[in-house]
């Protein structure tokens, strides 16, 4: 969480942003929010990118102004422009890439006065994991499966009735390279499985961590997986 | 009201060119981008490519040598070039506008020029 | 490129029917795929946008669903007026493309 001042004369308008991380080839949101103003034709908002000349995207006078748009930004960004009059400034970013991490800064002006507010953009591959068991192998195994994860991420098991054990040795990764050549398909093996037990598949890199969990008895399977974002808020 | 009006030649020779201007009305060519497509009875719709607010423009691979877009913002004019027409470019050439800065859909079209290329 | 293929390629139904048209991306496209109208000698129209949006004005007979390769366009009760063609296209990634039309006829 970043909160901005400004000073416009003796006026100064709050700026907030949200650290985020934004997910390779899906959509991303920056959020910025600021001290609304009822006149929408008296709001400026601007985007801009660190290292970057030209803007993210600029909204002035109630419309988008995107002249100065940087090319790699062009088609790819929108303003929640119904909600600019309650403060929300935050933009919408189409199929986001790798390259689009880095230091955003979201500038406002309104009548009431400026501020701006700095954002820390990263961008990965993160998905849930899904274990089945594996009954083709000899002995009872799990395999956890991700589709999608950028950087290479690590992989651990844990187990409820065994707390605290090392399974590296009973287990076995494999990233695959998915075919845009960026993100990879995790594929996890634990063997050697005991019945009535819950065991976790924990997937973590820089931006993400993500949980598979599987209990299994002599009657049913029951699975549940989660996905947390690390640094942001 | 958004309106997107065309104007251009139907029939062209063969190894000639092709203009067509697009005269935009109800929004401004800084805030949106213009796409360019074409409809044929052989290959359906065709997107040609797009001039942004910015200037800048995208053209399809496989018409890049021959596509050329510019525009005058002052005019909400936006002009298209396509060098060396063969019969197989006869088609219908429209002009259209994204539905939002975000390219989803294309919301508004031009009425279309018919482009026929025979000698 | 990215290929989109439209199924049927046409279609014959009686007023009130339920219709449902195909598109399929040879590659996933997330939600960006739009479904446009196309009646004899018109530009096309959008009808849905985002893969679900309905665009301004559109009356609410046709929904859109579907995301990353799978897209459907429903028309809970067909009528008269919506006898033309239909197109998908996908403006997730250049080329954006288009399908090649579903060519819905009314009994």
């Known amino acids: 969480l970043i909160i901005g001042f400004g000073i416009s004369g003796k006026h100064f308008i709050t700026v907030t942003t949200f650290t985020s991380a934004g997910n390779i080839g899906e959509d991303g949101t920056l959020s910025c929010t600021f001290e609304p103003d009822i006149k929408l034709n008296g709001i400026v908002i601007q985007w801009l990118k660190e290292g970057i000349k030209g803007l993210v995207h600029e909204f002035k006078e109630g419309k988008d102004d995107l002249s100065q748009q940087h090319e790699m930004f062009r088609g790819r960004t929108a303003v929640f422009a119904d909600q600019v009059v309650v403060g929300n400034a935050s933009l919408r970013l189409k199929n986001v890439q790798l390259t689009d991490a880095g230091t955003y800064t979201c500038y406002i002006r309104t009548s009431k006065g400026k501020g701006n507010a700095n954002l820390e953009y990263k961008t990965g591959a993160f998905s849930m994991p899904e274990i089945n068991v594996d009954y083709n192998a000899s002995s009872e195994s799990l395999r956890c499966e991700a589709p999608r994860w950028f950087p290479q991420p690590t992989v651990a098991w844990a187990s409820q009735v065994d707390q605290g054990a090392n399974f590296s040795e009973v287990s076995n990764t494999s990233f695959e390279l998915n075919s845009e050549n960026v993100t990879m398909k995790v594929v996890s093996v634990l063997y050697n499985v005991t019945i009535n037990n819950t065991y976790s598949c924990m997937i973590e890199n820089d931006i993400a961590k993500a949980t598979g969990d599987i209990k299994v008895t002599d009657s049913e399977v029951k699975r549940r997986s989660q996905l947390q974002l690390l640094n942001s808020g | 009201q958004i309106q997107l009006q065309q104007s251009g030649p139907g029939l062209v020779q063969p190894s000639q060119s092709l203009s067509i201007t697009c005269t935009v009305s109800g929004f401004s060519l800084t805030s949106y981008g213009v796409q360019w497509i074409r409809q044929s009875p052989g290959k359906g719709l065709e997107w040609l490519g797009v001039i942004w607010s910015s200037g800048s423009t995208d053209y399809n691979a496989a018409f890049l040598s021959r596509l050329s877009f510019s525009k005058d913002n002052s005019k909400s004019q936006v002009f298209f070039q396509m060098n060396s027409l063969q019969a197989d470019d006869s088609a219908i050439y429209y002009c259209?506008?994204?539905?939002?800065?975000?390219?989803?859909?294309?919301?508004?079209w031009g009425q279309g020029t018919l482009v026929t290329v025979s000698a | 490129n990215i290929v989109m293929t439209q199924s049927p390629k046409s279609m014959s139904m009686s007023v009130g029917e339920r219709v449902t048209l195909s598109c399929k991306a040879s590659e996933k496209v997330g939600t960006y795929v739009s479904w446009y109208q196309q009646k004899p000698e018109q530009s096309p129209k959008l009808l849905i946008y985002?893969?679900?949006n309905r665009y301004t004005g559109v009356p609410d007979r046709f929904t859109g669903s579907g995301s990353a390769t799978d897209f459907t366009l429903t028309i809970s009760s067909v009528q008269v007026e919506d006898l033309a063609d239909y197109h998908c296209g996908q403006t997730y990634s250049y080329p954006f493309t288009f399908g090649s039309g579903t060519k819905l006829e009314i009994k």
């Open positions: 985002g893969a679900s």
């Open positions: 259209a506008r994204d539905v939002t800065t975000i390219v989803e859909g294309f919301a508004h």
